[in-house]
Interface confidence: low
Amino acid sequence: LIIGFGISGRHSITVTTVASAGNIGEDGILSCTFEPDIKLSDIVIQWLKEGVLGLVHEFKEGKDELSEQDEMFRGRTAVFADQVIVGNASLRLKNVQLTDAGTYKCYIITSKGKGNANLEYKTGAFSMPEVNVDYNASSETLRCEAPRWFPQPTVVWASQVDQGANFSEVSNTSFELNSENVTMKVVSVLYNVTINNTYSCMIENDIAKATGDIKVTESEIKRRSHLQLLNSKAS
């Protein structure tokens, strides 16, 4: 994880943010922690976004203060109010939009001082792939499907037995636009598979990397999936 430390002012406190990514249409979290204060009533949390006039979110005197909130975030933000006193200023962002990407600032005021830190928030779509034996095909074929990706990812196949082999000649990948006209369904087909082998379908864009594994033997099929968010570069 990319962790940003920010210190400001003569009486400064340490504020720590973690670069993260949001999945379009789902809820996301912008992480921020700070040196806790013994008085909840003395803590002010402000979330700001570069290029946005109003506040993303403000929390003060133990409750949300949303009179200055920008319209684009209306009804979509919340802090974890029960965690503020132990130094958690993280922001929950509901229904993440593509336009939520950008640079955010977590600004904290406590009785000990002030501090802030920036975080880069990326938005896109990513989902877990599922690999199945395609029984409809005329030859031994595997089908890898993932319902939502954006931007368009790359798809690479690999196998445990033929490590390092290039499967581009024996695979076919298509991208189908979903109904909201942003995210796409990924379908990749691998031909001429052999029994007693483990195949991996790896889908990757600049936000996330996901892998779907399938082990095919004469007696059983075993599947496993894994998704990992990729670090954004430290600025």
Partner: antibody, heavy 116, light 107 residues
Framework: QVQLVQSGAEVKKPGSSMRVSCKAS????????ISWVRQAPGQGLEWMGG????????NYAQKFQGRVTITADKSTSTAYMELSSLRSEDTAVYYC?????????WGQGTLVTVSS | DIQLTQSPATLSVSPGERATLSCRAS??????LAWYQQKPGQAPRLLIY???IRATGIPARFSGSGSGTEFTLTISSLQSEDIATYYC?????????FGQGTRLEIK
Amino acid sequence: QVQLVQSGAEVKKPGSSMRVSCKASEDTFSSYAISWVRQAPGQGLEWMGGTAPIFGTTNYAQKFQGRVTITADKSTSTAYMELSSLRSEDTAVYYCARGGPYFDYWGQGTLVTVSS
Amino acid sequence: DIQLTQSPATLSVSPGERATLSCRASQSVSSNLAWYQQKPGQAPRLLIYGDYIRATGIPARFSGSGSGTEFTLTISSLQSEDIATYYCQQYVDLPITFGQGTRLEIK
């Protein structure tokens, strides 16, 4: 499942010290404060202090300042509360609880009896 | 320190009736108030926090209201399992303080 498991009951002499442990699940320990609350027989609840292991910070109620020490061992996800110079009025059930602002999970309680 | 005063000290209510418990703070605690239920020999159980938000698994018959210095816990239809002592607690400021408790009994 969040669980806070405390050490067993103790009988102590006046002037001595007591130490109660509270073992928490790992995620509780890394993300939440652990507080200590006591309850004398037939009496109400009294907050003694708390620690936020993730930040290494501790706060104590003024009443217990100088007599109470709250520590946390991250490697075992265990919090400890030590109270010194015991007197008979320290006889109470001592609870550890998850949270600093309010307490959503509690240990089972440890009865400490101070008697000569 | 912020003092919390609960009233009444003991409340007798018939099963199925409404029970109303009060908690008054010596200074404003905004919405930073929690309610707990404690039965004999058991640890307290969180009922309400943020003055009105029900904790996980708490039945809808329990509700909290108020803000600032005056708070109320209401049990809309008393069940026999609700017999317990109820405590309010503020967390706007340290030290965290509790009220002295209200004992709820069946009439």
